[in-house]
C-alpha cells in the first residue's frame, strides 16, 4: 500500500502539501512577536509566553497542548548588589571597574528586566589576586602553561577568552589548575569578523557587548538538585553542597573594552606563540600579575549572584498518529532566552511555530500522521538543558519504549552561508534524500537543490559528492534524548563559512544585541534561510512520522563505526611499545564492526523485500530500526558520567559542544603518557575496548533475523 493509504489520507496531503504551507512571512511575524521583551527562564514574561504558545498551538489544531512544570535550580544576579571586577591599587582602592550592563541597543533603551551579563551558577565571592591570561582555557592551554611554561595558576585569577570550547569546560579546567576566580571575555579575534561593522550598523560584537551563559559541568544530569529524576512536587532535593556540576570559584564575563583595561597591564611571561594572541592592542602577556609600574595593583572580583529553586514551564503539544499512536517523533526547541533571543532561541522557536501551524492546517483538512508527533517548547535550556532533561526524566519509560526520533530546533541560523547538519548516522540518507528535493535559497544556486549548494559549500571530508554531516555533541536539548536515552536524533541550521571558528558561535551570541533587527537587517531579510531550515526540520519530522518504513539506514552506521574504530586505533598506536607491553588489542572491536557491517547489510536486503502489507512484520522491522540507536546505550554509562550512556558518541570531556566517537576508549587514552600508574591506565583502555566491542556486537545482533 502507498503511504497515503496507510494513513487513510487523500493524495494531496503529502510532504509537498506540508512544505508548501510553510511561509517565510509567518516565520518573520512569529520571530518579531517572540523577541520584543526578554524571556529569561523562571520569569513571569517567559511563563506568559509559554501560555501564549500553548493557546496558539491549540488554535493551530493540535490534539492537546499541556504545560509541564518543574522546580529547578536557576541562578540570577543580585538586583541591588551588582557583579563587577575591579583593578585595585595597593591601598585597596578601586581604580577601574568593569561595566555593570551592556549599552542598550537603539530602540530598547527603556526595556526593563534586561538581565546584566553574568555567568549563571557562579558562586558568590570577592577574590583578589594576580591575573594570569590562559588563552581559551582549553586543556591544551593549561598543559602549555603548567608543563611547558611552568606557570602556576594556583591562587590566581585567570582571564580566558571565549571560543573554541564550551565555557563550562574552561571553568572546570581553571578550577583543576587551582585558580580562585575566572574572568571570561570576548576577543575581537573570535567575535569581530573583518570588514563588518559592529551592531547596530552590522552583525559584529561591539566592545561593550558581553556573552552570558551557564558555567555548569552537568554531564547530562539536568537539574543539579535532582539528577536522574524529575524536579516535581514531591522531589527529594540534594543540598547545595552535593548539587551536580556547580562551579566552586567565582566567574564573570566581560566585553573587549573592559578586557583591554585588564590585559594592557599584564606582565610576566610573553605569549608562547601567535595562537595565544587575539586582536586587541595589548601584549597578551601571560603574567602572573601586572607589569612594572602596575605590579602592586591586583584584580578583585565582586560576585553576588544567587542560586534559587524556580518554577519553569515546558509546552508539550501532541498530534496523535493515525496508525501507530504509540510511536513518537519529537520536534523540540527551547523558548527561554538570555535577553531578546533574536537568534537563540527565537529564530528556532518561530520555525517550530510555523511547522506546528502547517501540520495543524493539514490536520484540520482531515489528515493525520502515521505516528504521533510531539512538539515541545523547552524552558531553561540556557541554564543547563533543564526543561528538556526534566521532562525526559519524567517520561523516560515511555520514551525508551516509544521514541522513534528527536529533531532539535534551537537557533535556525548562526550565519547565512550554507546548511549545517549534525545527526545520528541512521538519518544520513533521510537528510540526503530530503535536501535533494528542496530548493537551495543560496545566491548563485537558483533552480538548484539544497543538496547541491550544501555539498558545494560544505563538502564531506571523506566522500566526494556528498555534504559534511557532523557528529552530535551536546550543549542543546537533544542531549538527554540521544546521549542518555538512545533515541535517534538530529539537528539542522544555516551556518557561516567559518570552519576555523566552529564552536565560538556568532559574534552577538547571548548578548543584548541579539535582537529581531539583527536577523531582519543583517542575517536574513527575506527569511529565506529560516524557511529552508523549516523545510529541513519539518520535512524530517514529516518523513519520520509518516513513512511506512522508518527512513533509517543502518548501513551508514556500519560505515562510521569502521571509521571511528580506525581513528581510535591510530590514536592508540601512537604508543606501540605500551600496546605490546600491556597486550592491548583492538581485534574484538574490529571483529564486532565487521559483524555489524555484515548483519546490517543483510537487514537492509530484508528491508527491501519484506511484505509491507503485513502490519506485524512491518512493525517488527520498524522496531528493529527504532531500537538500533537504543542498543548503543550502556546502562552503566561512561566512567564518572552516568548520564552519558551512548557508547559510540558522547560530548567531548574537553568541550561539551563537540562530539567524540568511542568516548570511553578516547578518554582512557587521553594524556595516558602522563599517568602515574601506566599499568592501571592501559588496563582501563583494555576495559573500554571490551565495552565498545561488546556493545557494537550486541547492537548488531538486534538487526539479526529474530528467529
Amino acid at each position: 500500500k502507498s503511504s497515503n493509504e496507510a494513513t487513510n489520507i487523500t493524495p494531496k496531503h503529502n510532504m509537498k502539501a506540508f512544505l508548501d504551507e510553510l511561509k517565510a512571512e509567518n516565520i518573520k511575524k512569529f520571530l518579531y512577536n517572540f523577541t520584543q521583551i526578554p524571556h529569561l527562564a523562571g520569569t513571569e514574561q517567559n511563563f506568559q509566553l509559554a501560555k501564549q504558545i500553548q493557546s496558539q498551538w491549540k488554535e493551530f489544531g493540535l490534539d492537546s497542548v499541556e504545560l509541564a512544570h518543574y522546580d529547578v535550580l536557576l541562578s540570577y544576579p543580585n538586583k541591588t548588589h551588582p557583579n563587577y571586577i575591579s583593578i585595585i591599587n595597593e591601598d585597596g582602592n578601586e581604580i577601574f571597574n568593569t561595566s555593570l550592563f551592556e549599552p542598550p541597543p537603539p530602540g530598547y533603551e527603556n526595556v526593563s528586566d534586561i538581565v546584566p551579563p553574568f555567568s549563571a551558577f557562579s558562586p558568590q565571592g570577592m577574590p583578589e589576586g594576580d591575573l594570569v591570561y590562559v588563552n581559551y582555557a582549553r586543556t591544551e592551554d593549561f598543559f602549555k602553561l603548567e608543563r611547558d611554561m611552568k606557570i602556576n595558576c594556583s591562587g590566581k585569577i585567570v582571564i580566558a577568552r571565549y571560543g573554541k570550547v564550551f565555557r563550562g569546560n574552561k571553568v572546570k579546567n581553571a578550577q583543576l589548575a587551582g585558580a580562585k576566580g575566572v574572568i571570561l571575555y570576548s576577543d575581537p579575534a573570535d567575535y569581530f569578523a573583518p570588514g563588518v561593522k559592529s551592531y547596530p550598523d552590522g552583525w559584529n560584537l561591539p566592545g561593550g557587548g558581553v556573552q552570558r551563559g551557564n558555567i555548569l559541568n552537568l554531564n547530562g544530569a539536568g537539574d543539579p538538585l535532582t539528577p536522574g529524576y524529575p524536579a516535581n512536587e514531591y522531589a527529594y532535593r540534594r543540598g547545595i553542597a552535593e548539587a551536580v556540576g556547580l562551579p566552586s570559584i567565582p566567574v564573570h564575563p566581560i566585553g573587549y573594552y573592559d578586557a583591554q583595561k585588564l590585559l594592557e597591564k599584564m606582565g610576566g611571561s610573553a605569549p608562547p606563540d601567535s595562537s595565544w594572541r587575539g586582536s586587541l592592542k595589548v601584549p597578551y602577556n601571560v603574567g602572573p600579575g601586572f607589569t612594572g609600574n602596575f605590579s602592586t595593583q591586583k584584580v578583585k572580583m565582586h560576585i553576588h549572584s544567587t542560586n534559587e529553586v524556580t518554577r519553569i514551564y515546558n509546552v508539550i503539544g501532541t498530534l496523535r498518529g493515525a496508525v501507530e499512536p504509540d510511536r513518537y517523533v519529537i520536534l523540540g526547541g527551547h523558548r527561554d532566552s538570555w535577553v531578546f533571543g533574536g537568534i537563540d532561541p527565537q529564530s528556532g522557536a518561530a520555525v517550530v511555530h510555523e511547522i506546528v501551524r502547517s501540520f495543524g492546517t493539514l490536520k484540520k483538512e482531515g489528515w493525520r500522521p502515521r505516528r504521533t508527533i510531539l512538539f515541545a517548547s523547552w524552558d531553561a535550556e540556557e541554564f543547563g538543558l533543564l526543561g528538556s532533561t526534566e521532562w525526559a526524566e519524567e517520561n523516560s519509560r515511555l520514551l525508551q519504549e516509544r521514541g522513534v526520533a528527536y529533531i532539535n530546533a534551537d537557533s535556525s541560523i548562526e550565519g547565512n552561508y550554507t546548511l549545517r547538519v549534525d545527526c545520528t548516522p541512521l538519518m544520513y540518507s533521510l537528510v540526503h534524500n530530503l535536501t535533494k528535493e528542496l530548493k537551495s535559497p543560496d545566491e548563485g544556486f537558483e533552480g538548484k537543490s539544497l543538496y547541491e549548494s550544501w555539498t558545494k559549500k560544505s563538502p564531506s571530508p571523506e566522500f566526494s559528492g556528498m555534504p559534511r554531516i557532523s557528529k552530535l555533541g551536546s550543549g542543546n536539548d537533544f542531549e538527554v534524548f540521544f546521549q542518555r536515552l538512545g533515541i535517534a536524533s538530529g539537528r539542522a541550521r544555516y551556518t557561516k563559512n567559518w570552519e576555523t571558528n566552529k564552536f565560538s558561535g556568532y559574534p552577538l551570541y547571548h548578548s543584548v544585541y541579539e535582537t529581531y533587527e539583527l536577523v531582519e537587517k543583517f542575517y536574513d531579510p527575506m527569511f529565506k534561510y529560516h524557511l529552508t531550515v523549516a523545510q529541513v526540520r519539518g520535512g524530517m519530522v514529516f518523513e519520520l512520522a509518516n513513512s511506512i518504513v522508518l527512513p533509517f539506514d543502518c548501513r551508514d552506521y556500519a560505515v562510521v563505526l569502521r571509521k571511528y574504530a580506525d581513528k581510535i586505533y591510530s590514536i592508540s598506536m601512537k604508543h606501540p611499545q605500551e600496546m605490546k607491553t600491556y597486550s592491548v588489542s583492538f581485534d574484538s572491536l574490529f571483529s564486532a564492526v565487521k559483524n555489524f557491517t555484515e548483519i546490517a547489510s543483510k537487514f537492509s536486503e530484508r528491508l527491501q523485500d519484506f511484505d509491507k502489507s503485513n502490519p506485524i512484520v512491518l512493525r517488527m522491522m520498524n522496531d528493529q530500526l527504532m531500537f538500533l540507536e537504543r542498543a548503543f546505550i550502556d546502562p552503566l554509562g561512561l566512567p564518572d558520567r552516568p548520564f552519558y550512556r551512548h557508547v559510540i558518541y558522547a560530548p567531548s570531556s574537553h568541550n561539551k559542544y563537540a562530539g567524540e566517537s568511542f568516548p570511553g576508549i578516547y578518554d582512557a587514552l587521553f594524556d595516558i603518557e602522563s599517568k602515574v600508574d601506566p599499568s592501571k591506565a592501559w588496563g582501563e583502555v583494555k576495559r573500554q575496548i571490551y565495552v565498545a566491542a561488546f556493545t557494537v556486537q550486541a547492537a548488531a545482533e538486534t538487526l539479526s533475523e529474530v528467529a
Epitope: 563587577y84 581604580i95 577601574f96 571597574n97 568593569t98 561595566s99 555593570l100 550592563f101 549599552p103 542598550p104 541597543p105 537603539p106 533603551e109 559592529s198 561591539p206 566592545g207 561593550g208 573594552y257 583591554q260 583595561k261 594592557e264 597591564k265 592592542k281 609600574n293
Partner: antibody, heavy 122, light 108 residues
C-alpha cells in the same frame, strides 16, 4: 540629529561652586561614555574628566581632582559637572563631548556641545 | 605623565599637502585621534583610531601612526582647512585623556 547642549556657565567668585549640565538628544545616551573638556581663553584643549556609560568609572585631570565631580542621569539624558572650590585658573569654555563608542578611554570624541563659559573672578 | 608634542604652526600653499605631527613616547602603541577647531567653534573629530575618518570628513584627511610619531595629512589643502588641529590619546598609565598643545594650520 545628535546634539549636546551645555548650560550653567556663569561668573563666580573664587572658592564658590557651580554646576554645569549637558543635555543630550538624538542618540542612545545610556550607551556612551562622556567627557568634559575645557579651553581657557587663547589656550589649547584641556581634558577635565570622563564618566563611563554606566557610571561605574570616573576619571579626573590632576588639576581638578578632589574639587570637581562628574555624574550622569541616564533617565534624564543629562551629564553634570559639579565644580567646587573654583579658582581663577578654572576660567574657560567647558565642552561636553561623547565618545564614538561606549568605551570612554581609547576612542575619539565625535560629538561636542557648543560650550558654556565659566569665569572665576573676584 | 604622558605628553604629546605638536608644532605650534604649519603653513601650506593651497592645493599642496600639509602634514601635522604629534610626538609621544611609543605613541604607535596607542590609538590617536585628531580634532579640527575653527575660531569660536567647538572641536570636530576628523580622524580617529590613527587613520579612520568619520562620515562627512573629506578623504583628503588621513592619518598614520607608528613608532614615536603620529601624523595628520591634509592633501589638496583648501582655505577652509585653516584651523587649529589637536591630537589626542588615552594614557593608561595615568588613566587620563591627553591632548597635544595644538597646531595652527595656515593655508597661504
Amino acid at each position: 540629529q545628535v546634539q549636546l547642549q551645555e548650560s550653567g556657565g556663569d561668573v563666580v567668585q573664587p572658592g564658590r561652586s557651580l554646576r554645569l549640565s549637558c543635555a543630550a538628544s538624538g542618540f542612545s545616551f545610556s550607551g556612551y561614555g562622556l567627557h568634559w573638556v575645557r579651553q581657557a581663553p587663547g589656550r589649547g584643549l584641556e581634558w577635565v574628566t570622563l564618566i563611563s556609560y554606566d557610571g561605574s568609572n570616573k576619571y579626573y585631570a590632576d588639576s581638578v581632582k578632589g574639587r570637581f565631580t562628574i555624574s550622569r542621569d541616564n533617565s534624564k539624558n543629562t551629564l553634570y559637572l559639579q565644580m567646587n572650590s573654583l579658582r581663577a585658573e578654572d576660567t574657560a569654555v567647558y565642552y561636553c563631548a561623547k565618545t564614538t563608542v561606549s568605551d570612554p578611554y581609547y576612542y575619539g570624541m565625535d560629538v561636542w556641545g557648543q560650550g558654556t563659559t565659566v569665569t572665576v573672578s573676584s | 605623565s604622558y605628553e604629546l608634542t605638536q608644532p605650534p604652526s604649519v603653513s601650506v600653499a593651497p592645493g599642496q599637502t600639509a602634514r601635522i605631527t604629534c610626538g609621544g613616547n611609543n605613541i604607535g602603541s596607542k590609538s590617536v585621534h585628531w580634532y579640527q577647531q575653527k575660531p569660536g567653534q567647538a572641536p570636530v573629530l576628523v580622524v580617529y583610531d590613527d587613520s579612520d575618518r568619520p562620515s562627512g570628513i573629506p578623504e583628503r584627511f588621513s592619518g598614520t601612526n607608528s613608532g614615536n610619531t603620529a601624523t595628520l595629512t591634509i592633501s589638496r589643502a583648501e582655505a577652509g582647512d585653516e584651523a587649529d588641529y589637536y591630537c589626542q590619546v588615552w594614557d593608561s598609565s595615568s588613566d587620563h585623556v591627553v591632548f597635544g598643545g595644538g597646531t595652527k594650520l595656515t593655508v597661504l
